[in-house]
Amino acid sequence: AILGRSETQECLFFNANWEKDRTNQTGVEPCYGDKDKRRHCFATWKNISGSIEIVKQGCWLDDINCYDRTDCVEKKDSPEVYFCCCEGNMCNEKFSYFPEMEVTQPTSNPVTPKPP
């Protein structure tokens, strides 16, 4: 591992659609990928009338958008489905939303997912 870099070997796994997809609902996912490429964790969720609904969590392949991010933070302004990625084992256990917008608009509070 490169000094100062968190290598991702496993991520929190969650699938809201687990019955239809015939997977576990929750657990720990080992991350696979090309040996020289970086691996990350991700989380996706929806905000339904102020209520946070996790869609999926798991491993994510080498992506410069995720480099050196120890926290899973969505920065896109009001996406349909929120997505964040990070580096480090189980770094997707917590995720938050801090949109990058004009200074006049306040940022949102961090989101702590409700247990399934």
Epitope: K37, V55, L61, E80, F83
Partner: antibody, heavy 115, light 111 residues
């Protein structure tokens, strides 16, 4: 092993639409992006757009904005690229590629636009 | 994002070295280590050779190397072989907040 298998060649009339599919196997489809690239006969590669296969979020090249739609069907591990209002200049081989680095490519789909 | 600039063609004899350049701007090539190189033989799909400026893709011979100086990325092929004759494209990472762009391509002829 990772494979991206694309749908077969298409011949289309000007003004119509085409939808090309790209079926992924050998990796977890929802763990990366799918990018779409085209190559006109004797020309270079041209990036069209990308989709995040888990969130469905898309980005398109300005040139194709409003004319291209990229979607992903998680249940079949398949990505789709639909191009509308076709013109003769859209005659090209269309490729899908995995991830932001384009590390695996489909075999290509020739779309011919001719009246 | 405007296309990256590559020479139309380069050539070299077997055993020689050739370098293909890819020039962008300070806001793309100059700012990020996200330039890739692809090899394409006639009638075939492109193949990733180098990613992230200088990282060799798995299975790619170490005769292929990538580097960057300022706003220009370079692909160097040493010990040229007949099978290296192909078109080479530089391109950028695409996904998330990054938009893709390719160079115009360089035809490598092995004399």
């Amino acid at each position: 092993q990772v494979q991206l298998v694309q749908s077969g060649a298409e011949v289309k009339k000007p003004g119509s639409s085409v939808k090309v599919s790209c079926k992924a196997s050998g990796y977890k489809f929802t763990s990366s992006y799918i990018n779409w690239v085209r190559q006109a006969p004797g020309q270079g590669l041209e990036w069209m757009g990308t989709i995040n296969a888990v969130s469905g979020s898309t980005s398109y090249a300005q040139k194709f904005q409003g004319r291209v739609t990229i979607t992903a069907d998680e249940s079949t591990s398949t990505a789709y690229m639909e191009l509308s209002s076709l013109r003769s200049e859209d005659t090209a081989v269309y490729y899908c590629a995995r991830g932001g680095w384009f590390d695996y490519w489909g075999q290509g789909t020739l779309v011919t636009v001719s009246s | 994002q405007s296309a990256l600039t590559q020479p139309r063609s380069v050539s070299g004899s077997p055993g020689q070295s050739v370098t293909i350049s890819c020039t962008g701007t300070s806001s793309d090539v100059g700012s990020y280590n996200y330039v890739n190189w692809y090899q394409q033989h006639p009638g075939k799909a492109p193949k990733l050779m180098i990613y992230g400026v200088s990282k060799r893709e798995s299975g790619v011979p170490d005769r292929f190397s990538g580097s960057k100086s300022g706003n220009t990325a370079s692909l160097t092929i040493s010990g040229l072989q007949a099978e290296d004759e192909a078109d080479y494209y530089c391109g950028t990472f695409a996904g998330g907040k990054y938009y893709g762009v390719f160079g115009g391509g360089t035809k490598l002829t092995v004399l």
